[in-house]
């Protein structure tokens, strides 16, 4: 049994950097916790942009410092990435992971395309 | 090293070049002229671990990821532990995309 | 895996096939390369998918429960012990191995 990950195909981040998407998991089993991480690609680079761990029923917590939230409703969380900027458009990948109880599953979105438009500066007033 | 069957013998790998506790991490072995087989994962944080059937209640696997270490502790070796042990780590996308170059366990009276 | 040897010369096509006893999904199928004396080396995830560094020789493909490594052309170090894996559930299994030796 394989566990598929559905996510958005593109999306485009606020004027204020924010971006949000769904990642929606079909659950091969009654997982009681489940790990959500965000990765990055940019050509053949695979960088971590968050994770959180979360107790099936709970919200998931990303760390302090962490650029994204997220909440998580059933087999759907809800993520917002913020702080963006037009250099941080790319390819955001979705992963899941039963963590517990066995059998682990490992699940992959295909990627959500975000598209990052840096805000023109207001002109200067006289 | 040589260790004689019924005792006991502690793997350690030391990892560099990467966000240790962003990975999970493996041991897998490979008994003499064999094939690979996964032994023991250990997530993340270290709360939580798998293990194969063959080595269930014997093998323990921890990290400690303030100095990016695994640890396999193995207890109750049999002849048929004997094996090149190596840890891997579990790339962003789920294959093992890093080994260590191997330690050989032989368990041997 | 088979089969288990592959007698091939350098600059042949060496194709090698792993065969799943079950089901599975193509983005958790891995091939690794093992020299004599090595560590294994990831070649190809996601069962097409090329590992960083690993030369546009090799290339993999299938679905479901057929998957297929191909060496389009052989050279001196590509003679080595090739295993698939599947990495998409717990246990992560292996599969037994082809032997691919100069002919």
């Known amino acids: 049994k394989a566990m598929h990950v559905a996510q958005p195909a593109v999306v485009l981040a606020s004027s204020r950097g924010i971006a949000s998407f769904v990642c929606e998991y079909a659950s091969p089993g009654k997982a009681t916790e489940v790990r959500v991480t965000v990765l990055r690609q940019a050509d053949s680079q695979v960088t971590e942009v968050c994770a959180a761990t979360y107790m099936m029923g709970n919200e998931l917590t990303f760390l302090d410092d962490s650029i994204c939230t997220g909440t998580s409703s059933g087999n759907q969380v809800n993520l917002t990435i913020q702080g963006l900027r037009a250099m941080d458009t790319g390819l955001y990948i979705c992963k899941v992971e039963l963590m517990y109880p066995p059998p682990y599953y490992l699940g992959i979105g295909n990627g959500t395309q975000i598209y990052v438009i840096d805000p023109e500066p207001c002109p200067d007033s006289d | 090293g040589v260790v004689q069957p019924g005792r006991s013998l502690r793997l350690s790998c030391v990892a560099s070049?990467?966000?240790?506790?962003?990975?999970?991490m493996h041991w897998v072995r490979q008994a003499p002229g064999k094939g690979l087989e996964w032994v023991a994962v250990?997530?993340?944080?270290?709360?939580?671990?798998y293990y194969a059937d063959s080595v269930k209640g014997r093998f323990t696997i921890s990290r400690d990821n303030s100095k990016n270490t695994l640890f396999l502790q193995m207890n109750s070796l049999r002849a048929e532990d004997t094996a090149v042990y190596y840890c891997?780590?579990?790339?962003?996308?789920?294959?093992?995309?890093?080994w260590g170059q191997g330690t050989l366990v032989t368990v041997s009276s | 895996q088979s089969p288990g040897t592959l007698s091939l010369s350098p600059g042949e096509r060496a194709t090698l096939s792993c065969r799943a006893s079950?089901?599975?999904?193509?983005?958790?199928l891995a091939w690794y390369q093992q020299r004599p004396g090595q560590a294994p080396r990831l070649l190809i995830y996601?069962?097409?998918s090329r590992a960083t560094g690993i030369p546009d020789r090799f290339s993999g493909s299938g679905s479901g429960t057929d998957f297929t490594l191909t060496i389009s052309r052989l050279e001196p170090e590509d003679f080595a012990v090739y295993y698939c894996?599947?990495?998409?559930?717990?246990?992560?299994?292996f599969g037994q191995g082809t032997k691919v030796e100069i002919k």
């Open positions: 996601g069962a097409s």
């Open positions: 079950q089901s599975i999904s193509s983005s958790f």
């Open positions: 894996q599947q990495y998409g559930t717990s246990p992560w299994t």
């Open positions: 070049g990467f966000t240790f506790s962003s990975h999970g």
């Open positions: 891997a780590r579990g790339g962003h996308f789920g294959p093992f995309d890093y």
């Open positions: 250990i997530w993340y944080d270290g709360r939580n671990k």
